[in-house]
């Protein structure tokens, strides 16, 4: 049983990486002297209590920054937010903290991240680039929901 977070780097199919800008994650083309974030991820320890066949439920954070990705409704709209939170505190909680959990599905080299709190909503970036990460229900051309996740050992 793994009880320390794994580290990884993420880019989308357009080779954009995730960068932290003013406490917001944005996707930008990789350039020299740029510092993409390193992702910290850990599987939910209560995996048996969550839906089967949707992917591996994980907590997603930014390595070394005590920031985790979470989903919350603003009005009627689920939104993606960064919250100050220790990923291991989430991991150790008595119950799955659904607002911070994502079903991680892999198909070949592509990964998707679906909100556990809001099924059908996925982490996405606008096809335009330089935009914040969002949650979307629309898996069409306007947004990219497929990411390449490379684990760092």
């Amino acid at each position: 049983k793994i009880d320390t977070p794994q580290r990884g780097s993420i880019q989308d199919i357009n080779h954009r990486v995730w960068v932290l800008q003013d406490q917001t994650l944005i996707a930008v083309p990789r350039k020299d002297r740029m510092s993409p974030v390193t992702i910290a991820l850990i599987s939910c320890r209560h995996v048996e209590t969550l839906e089967k066949d949707r992917g591996n439920p994980i907590y997603l954070g930014l390595n070394g920054l005590n920031l985790c990705l979470m989903c919350a409704k603003v009005g009627d709209q689920p939104t993606l937010q960064l919250k100050e939170k220790d990923i291991m505190d989430l991991y150790n909680q008595p119950e799955p903290v659904k607002s911070f959990l994502f079903y991680h599905s892999q198909s070949g080299r592509n990964s998707t991240f679906e909100s556990v709190a809001f099924p059908g909503w996925f982490i996405a970036v606008s096809s335009e680039g330089g935009c914040p990460l969002i949650l979307t229900q629309e898996l069409g051309k306007a947004n990219t929901t497929d990411f390449g996740l490379t684990m760092l050992f």
Partner: antibody
Framework: EVQLQQSGAELVKPGASVKLSCTVS????????MYWVKQRPEQGLEWIGR????????KYDPKFQGKATLTADTSSNTAYLQLSSLTSEDTAVYFC??????????????WGQGTTLTVSS | QAVVTQESALTTSPGETVTLTCRSS?????????ANWVQEKPDHLFTGLIG???NRAPGVPARFSGSLIGDKAALTITGAQTEDEAIYFC?????????FGGGTKLTVL
Amino acid sequence: EVQLQQSGAELVKPGASVKLSCTVSGFNIKDTYMYWVKQRPEQGLEWIGRIDPANGYAKYDPKFQGKATLTADTSSNTAYLQLSSLTSEDTAVYFCARFHWYDSAFYFDFWGQGTTLTVSS
Amino acid sequence: QAVVTQESALTTSPGETVTLTCRSSSGAVTTSNYANWVQEKPDHLFTGLIGGTNNRAPGVPARFSGSLIGDKAALTITGAQTEDEAIYFCGLWYSNHWVFGGGTKLTVL
């Protein structure tokens, strides 16, 4: 306003089964975890188990495995506790409680008023 | 299974500070026990006060605070009021189940 309304007192015979209900208003039970707790006079509280109404998955304290069955009906916003093979040891007040995440922690924040179960021949 | 022990009864006066504690038979209470504190008033009226050791539930007055003191979880009421007279239960998480204490009957005279 959040309210948990439990079913009325029950008097049942040893060996029988009983199903207690907890009807919730003011929030959707799919958005939280529902816990059940037993209270006997002078014996504190005992955790029976919990259910995630969003997927029906229940977890039990080992002491109550086989004795208690937790279910939930999201259409009526109601959680249920069924107790089987009743004995005098099951005579107690049973509470449902919401176990809810706010910002940085889980809390047993709202409780039902309790259902008194008496097992007697 | 672990046994969780609380003071059976405590008495305080209005305006005083009182601390209730919660001990585990399996060793020191830590933040991984996610201590919760609930209040019971007459007629089985329960209210959650503290979660995750030291987080106050929404709407709970600031005079209630949770902490770890030595090897125990603690609930401190700073400036007790007559309406705080109640039974207080702590609950500790042990990896896959909760164990509650027997409760502390607090009298505010």
